[in-house]
């Protein structure tokens, strides 16, 4: 004969545990029903009556099957440097993440507690490592033969143009200037235009996130900004 299915509340067999989505109530000494996500225990079970569940009130939630007397409060509204990536509902907490051009300087269990603006690399410096959601850009000086003339959280150093005759030699913050004969550029033909990354940062100046122009393939002087360090080396 099949074993009889016990309905909550019921006394468990000695040494056995309550079933999935049930909990053992110490007072009643019975296995009782848990409340579903989005609800909480309004009345705890007794030996003769099961748990009475009620929906969470506005701005409160429960994410798991539970028997808590009150739902949890949703986190405070996202700050101006954040975007709400998950709204507060009866079943889930609000999640705030940093907006583009910022990174999470202090994280919490889900989302971010404190966002900080991505550092910008000054001219003569490029993005050695792009920022990620949780880490800042690392700026380093341009290596010999490369330059960056921008203040940016995304631009890398790029090679000086190669001149037949140099009018002004390039340095870390300025491209070489050629005499009237057209220069050759150390860029492969059909070079891809790099899209603006979602979030990256750079050196020594107060950041104000700004779009960064992709590298120009028409090599007229003066040169535009360095190509951005597109994407982010994520954690």
């Amino acid at each position: 004969l099949p074993a009889q299915v016990a309905f909550t509340p019921y006394a468990p067999e000695p040494g056995s545990t309550c079933r999935l989505r049930e909990y053992y109530d110490q007072t009643a000494q019975m296995c009782c029903s848990k409340c579903s996500p989005g609800q909480h225990a309004k009345v705890f079970c007794t030996k003769t009556s099961d748990t009475v569940c009620d929906s969470c009130e506005d701005s409160t939630y429960t994410q798991l099957w539970n028997w808590v007397p009150e739902c949890l409060s949703c986190g405070s509204r996202c700050s101006s440097d954040q975007v709400e990536t998950q709204a507060c509902t009866r079943e889930q907490n609000r999640i705030c993440t940093c907006r583009p051009g910022w990174y999470c300087a202090l994280s919490k269990q889900e989302g971010c507690r404190l966002c900080a603006p991505l550092r910008k690399c000054r001219p003569g410096f490029g993005v050695a490592r792009p920022g990620t959601e949780t880490s800042d850009v690392v700026c380093k000086p341009c290596a010999p033969g490369t330059f960056s003339n921008t203040t940016s959280s995304t631009d890398i150093c790029r090679p000086h143009q190669i001149c037949n005759v140099v009018a002004i030699p390039g340095n870390a913050s300025m491209d070489a200037v050629c005499t009237s004969t057209s220069p050759t550029r150390s860029m492969a033909p059909g070079a891809v235009h790099l899209p603006q990354p979602v979030s990256t940062r750079s050196q020594h100046t107060q950041p104000t996130p700004e779009p960064s122009t992709a590298p120009s393939t028409s090599f007229l002087l003066p040169m535009g900004p360095s190509p951005p360090a597109e994407g982010s080396t994520g954690d």
Epitope: G126, E230, G231, T233
Partner: antibody, heavy 118, light 107 residues
Framework: EVQLQQSGPELRRPGSSVKLSCKAS????????LHWVKHSPEHGLEWIGW????????KYGQKFQSKATLTADTSSNAAYMQLSSLTSEDSATYFC???????????WGQGASVTVSS | DIVMTQSPTSMSISVGDRVTLNCKAS??????VDWYQQKTGQSPKVLLY???IRYTGVPDRFTGSGSGTEFTFTITNMQAEDLAVYFC?????????FGSGTKLEIK
């Protein structure tokens, strides 16, 4: 350009540790991030991590988090990698590489061979 | 981890040939791919960064293209001194990962 000079080959017993050095000349190591890369016939090139000698900040690949420790000494213009609890799996050639504002590994050391054998 | 699948593994070529190598990323890496050359007994040397930017001092016979998941590295007019192993590397996300390399040999 920066040149990176690595320490010589090392032979170690299983369970011991080894410290490799990478000395920069021509430029200050603070001008670069310094990466370490493992090269073995079985796994090819594997990124271990980087250190920013300017502030000592490090970033490790998860696989090497408990294996490698990266340090730098600005006074000697050198970076170091210590490998602990060595096993035969750690037998490989290890490269250091300098990363400037180009975002790439501009210059590499000549490599240091580590052999772990009993 | 992002897997960089490089093809072919090896290639026999003649001086003057046009050589094309491919690198395929297991997920979108934008343009965050570098190409390196490693000659026998030497350390690697960067040739191209950000998929297509030729590093300073690198001859213009080396070119690169691609973005997203498909990348191409080309040597036009192969020279004897170009015999080496070439590998790609992605730095879009940690851990940084490398292709297994392509060995160029003389036919």
């Amino acid at each position: 350009e920066v040149q990176l000079q690595q320490s010589g080959p090392e032979l170690r017993r299983p369970g011991s540790s080894v410290k490799l050095s990478c000395k920069a000349s021509g430029y200050s190591i603070t001008d670069y991030l310094l990466h370490w890369v493992k090269h073995s016939p079985e796994h090819g090139l594997e990124w271990i991590g980087w250190i920013d000698p300017e502030d000592g900040k490090t970033k490790y690949g998860q696989k090497f988090q408990s294996k490698a420790t990266l340090t730098a000494d600005t006074s000697s213009n050198a970076a170091y990698m210590q490998l602990s609890s060595l096993t035969s799996e750690d037998s490989a050639t290890y490269f250091c590489a300098a990363n400037s504002g180009t975002g790439t590994m501009d210059a590499w050391g000549q490599g240091a061979s580590v052999t772990v054998s009993s | 981890d992002i897997v960089m699948t490089q093809s072919p593994t090896s290639m026999s070529i003649s001086v003057g040939d046009r050589v094309t190598l491919n690198c395929k990323a297991s997920q979108n890496v934008g343009s965050n791919v570098d190409w390196y050359q490693q000659k026998t007994g030497q350390s690697p040397k960067v040739l191209l960064y950000k998929a297509s930017i030729r590093y300073t001092g690198v001859p213009d016979r080396f070119t690169g293209s691609g973005s997203g998941t498909e990348f191409t590295f080309t040597i036009t007019n192969m020279q004897a001194e170009d015999l080496a192993v070439y590998f790609c590397m992605q730095s879009k996300s940690y851990p940084i990962t490398f292709g297994s390399g392509t060995k160029l040999e003389i036919k």
